[in-house]
């Protein structure tokens, strides 16, 4: 039985050209996290964080994605095309797969405030 829940940074906004941290946290389960995958709105993989082996940033994103903090991901040099959904997929044993959703809005305005709050999707 899957008892865990994923908390995420929820809906966030950030300035074009800036950076943003995507964060998820799995709680309420004793399952072992074997891998966390970060995916973009078009379902392309951004990065994989393997519990034993560390980070693999996908070749297409190496210049704009930085691992961490923790199991999170930092997107840099944001463009308007980065607006959309992001997913953290926790692969666990023996529970199976947990998935969290974050919506990022990239704003042109120089007054765009980076909002980040933890919420359960």
């Amino acid at each position: 039985m899957m008892t865990g829940t994923i908390e995420t940074t929820g809906n966030i906004s950030a300035k074009k050209g800036g950076s943003v941290i995507l964060q998820c946290h799995l709680s309420s389960t004793m399952a072992q996290v074997t891998q966390v995958n970060w995916e973009q709105h078009d379902h392309s993989l951004l990065a994989i964080r393997n519990a034993e082996l560390g980070w693999h940033i996908y070749p297409a994103f190496k210049d704009r994605v930085a691992p961490g903090p923790g199991l999170g991901l930092t997107l840099q040099s944001l463009t308007m095309n980065d607006t959309g959904e992001y997913f953290c997929t926790y692969h666990t044993y023996p529970d199976g797969t947990y998935r969290g959703r974050i919506f990022l809005e990239v704003l042109e305005s120089s007054v765009a405030e980076h909002s980040a709050r933890f919420q359960i999707p």
């Epitope: 995958n37 994989i48 519990a51 034993e52 082996l53 693999h56 996908y58």
Partner: antibody
């Protein structure tokens, strides 16, 4: 260049423990991931598990209760132990390196493989 | 576990002609797929990673494509040295799993 060489008995009796060692040259096993993969006769490849640069291990759940992967950093080698073997464990066993940072879960260096037959 | 199903099981190709191998995942693995070639009497060798990136030293006649559940390895012009068994592998989730293999022969 990274080179891997498997060694161990080619014949193991049923219910006994299969033990193999992989000697690594040209690279330190305190970097990257060191894997065991097997190939039963006429079949595909099966991941057994790996030991990481820090010594942490991951085992395929289908074999987890019978597998131990360990390492000896002073000899730059790592080992596989598979207990309670049956004829189904007859296979070519490969040791392999995986550079997770650059290639994800894709294996970039393989040993030449060693054939292990389980038979009385 | 994710099952990787390869088709065809075998392929006989005239030198200089193209060849295509398909790999289907039992669930969405995004682009976390690698391809290997196991030449006769040898260990597997990495050809493609991340679905479409050629590994160092792999000739450009080899190309990988696909995402989600459907992946393809193409050889634009098959050469005699390309014979062997080709395997796909997913690393989207553990345990990482391989396809059953496709044997490529020369006519």
């Amino acid at each position: 260049e990274v080179q891997l060489q498997e060694s161990g008995p080619g014949l193991v009796k049923p219910s006994e423990t299969l033990s193999l060692t992989c000697a690594v040259s040209g690279y330190s096993i305190t970097s990257d991931s060191w894997n065991w993969i097997r190939q039963p006769p006429g079949k595909g490849l099966e991941w057994i598990g790996y030991i990481s640069y820090s010594g942490n291990t991951y085992y395929n759940p289908s074999l987890k209760s019978r597998v131990t992967i360990s390492r000896d950093t002073s000899k730059n080698q790592f080992s596989l132990k598979l207990s309670s073997v049956t004829a189904a464990d007859t296979a070519v066993y490969y040791c392999a390196r995986l550079d997770f940072s650059n290639y994800g879960g894709a294996v970039d260096y393989w040993g030449q493989g060693t054939t292990v037959t389980v038979s009385s | 576990d994710i099952v990787m199903t390869q088709t065809p099981l075998s392929l006989s190709v005239t030198p200089g002609q193209p060849a295509s191998i398909s790999c289907k995942a039992s669930q969405n693995v995004r682009t976390a797929v690698a391809w290997y070639l196991q030449k006769p009497g040898q260990s597997p060798q990495l050809m493609i990673y991340s679905a479409s990136y050629r590994y160092t030293g792999v000739p450009d006649r080899f190309s990988g494509s696909g995402s989600g559940t459907d992946f393809t390895l193409k050889i634009s012009r098959v050469e005699a040295e390309d014979v062997g068994v080709y395997y796909c592998q997913q690393y989207y989730t553990t345990p990482w799993t391989f396809g059953g293999g496709t044997k490529v022969e020369i006519k």
